[in-house]
């Protein structure tokens, strides 16, 4: 969709991982004066929502309240602006935003090798495992907008596991992992218990600004 106006922006508050039965606000905004905003979802159940734009200080926006969260509401969202209503003249679409429902299945376990406290520069690997036959595991770090994902390995000792090599440790952080199944990519398990990774001998434990991730499955992504 080329659109007669440039694309609006789409944000999720408080974030794109939404627990079952909770609500997420998807905010569509632009510095173009759009009278209408349309929010379109692709996924298990497609839908389009419409709101009239609000205008403040040269910004047009619409806050779409999505919830109580359930599987049909998870998917890839894009928002469009329109200056007219009948017919709509749609802008280019916003960048896609994947909204994931969590809390559907049993939580996996998260552990660190060699342990959750490591020396600066030492390599650390986080392992996510479960007796449930998850196809994918997703690792998130508190304060970062994106997760990295790995395919689960074959069943070993009754569990399915994925290892996330974090590389040489420079900064600590609180990590969680989730499991999901191949045919339901937007439907994730309960979160693992949080795992605090501490880096000792580090002059600063402040976080780097999150970098734009590569989202290729199976590519190690450094969340440190």
């Amino acid at each position: 969709h080329e659109g007669v106006h440039r694309k609006p922006s789409l944000l999720a508050h408080p974030g794109r991982l939404v627990k079952s039965e909770e609500t997420v606000i998807l905010q569509c905004w632009s510095d173009v004066r759009f009278e209408h905003f349309l929010l379109h979802r692709e996924g298990k159940f497609k839908d389009t929502l419409h709101l009239i734009g609000e205008h403040h200080d040269g910004v047009s926006k619409a806050n779409f309240s999505i919830g109580p969260m359930m599987q049909d509401l998870a998917g890839t969202y894009r928002c469009y602006g329109s200056v007219t209503h009948s017919p709509y003249q749609l802008s280019a679409p916003s960048d896609p935003l994947d909204i994931v429902i969590t809390g559907l299945y049993e939580k996996p376990s998260l552990s660190a090798q060699p342990g959750p406290t490591v020396l600066a520069g030492e390599s650390v690997t986080l392992s996510c495992s479960s007796r449930s036959s998850y196809d994918m595991y997703h690792l998130s770090r508190e304060g970062e907008a994106h997760e990295c994902r790995f395919s689960a390995g074959p069943k070993v000792n009754g569990t399915f596991q994925a290892d996330f090599p974090l590389g040489p440790a420079t900064h600590g952080g609180t990590y969680r992992c989730f499991g999901s199944f191949r045919d339901s990519p937007y439907e994730w398990s309960n979160s693992s218990d949080p795992l605090l990774v501490s880096v000792t001998g580090n002059p600063s434990n402040s976080w780097p600004s999150p970098t734009e991730p590569s989202s290729k499955t199976g590519n190690p992504r450094h969340l440190h």
């Epitope: 349309l38 497609k46 839908d47 389009t48 309240s65 049909d72 509401l73 009948s86 709509y88 749609l90």
Partner: antibody, heavy 124, light 108 residues
Framework: QVQLVQSGAEVKKPGSSVKVSCKAS????????ISWVRQAPGQGLEWMGG????????NYAQKFQGRVTITADESTSTAYMELSSLRSEDTAVYYC?????????????????WGQGTTVTVSS | EIVLTQSPGTLSLSPGERATLSCRAS???????LAWYQQKPGRAPRLLIY???SRATGIPDRFSGSGSGTDFTLTISRLEPEDFAVYYC?????????FGQGTKLEIK
């Protein structure tokens, strides 16, 4: 005042197809959620699927997947439901219905406006 | 799919009485995604309640809905002659959207 007006009754042979239309007047058809619901004689209601015309995206109940096609023509504010490989069990009244759309409604699955219904009889 | 079971199948009451219709789901349905309809012979259904408890436009306040999880209720506080019809509950919280089999409300 929004109205949905459906096409007339149809008599079809088993194995054939039927296409029912639903013309909307009033309101903004583009962003409507138009669903199709059927009711066999003396039976309850059954949701078949629906469409939102502006993006042409349709959802179907698994039971009808592959046999039903729901489309919409924005230029004429008309939605269509085509059901193929008809059998006697498809004899029913077919309704189009608009999903309630207010700012606090996130799923347009409660149907506030209905067409008058189209009777489809499948008989050899 | 979510199966909705309505009870009773038939309810015989007199005008002026209170009617209580039940709808039970085979699995939990968020109360935001449950509706009630009234249908008279030869007519299309009419939306009464959405979101389990919100009255649709133009519906008299003698109709009220309540419930959560798997148990939902439609109450008609004082039956009017025009209320005798078939009532359906419907969930739209999980596709495919499904309806109950209906409760027939008849004059005693």
């Amino acid at each position: 005042q929004v109205q949905l007006v459906q096409s007339g009754a149809e008599v079809k042979k088993p194995g054939s197809s039927v296409k029912v239309s639903c013309k909307a007047s009033g309101g903004t058809f583009s962003s409507y959620a138009i669903s199709w619901v059927r009711q066999a004689p003396g039976q309850g209601l059954e949701w078949m699927g629906g469409i939102i015309p502006i993006f042409g995206t349709a959802n179907y109940a698994q039971k009808f997947q592959g046999r039903v096609t729901i489309t919409a023509d924005e230029s004429t504010s008309t939605a269509y439901m085509e059901l193929s490989s008809l059998r006697s069990e498809d004899t029913a009244v077919y309704y189009c219905a608009r999903g309630l759309d207010t700012p606090n409604v996130v799923v347009k699955g409660a149907f506030d406006i209905w067409g008058q219904g189209t009777t489809v009889t499948v008989s050899s | 799919e979510i199966v909705l079971t309505q009870s009773p199948g038939t309810l015989s009451l007199s005008p002026g009485e209170r009617a209580t219709l039940s709808c039970r789901a085979s699995q939990s349905v968020s109360s935001s995604y449950l509706a009630w309809y009234q249908q008279k012979p030869g007519r299309a259904p009419r939306l009464l309640i959405y979101g389990a408890s919100s009255r649709a436009t133009g519906i008299p306040d003698r109709f009220s809905g309540s419930g959560s999880g798997t148990d939902f209720t439609l109450t008609i506080s004082r039956l009017e002659p025009e209320d005798f019809a078939v009532y359906y509950c419907q969930q739209y919280g999980s596709s495919p959207w499904t309806f109950g089999q209906g409760t027939k409300l008849e004059i005693k």
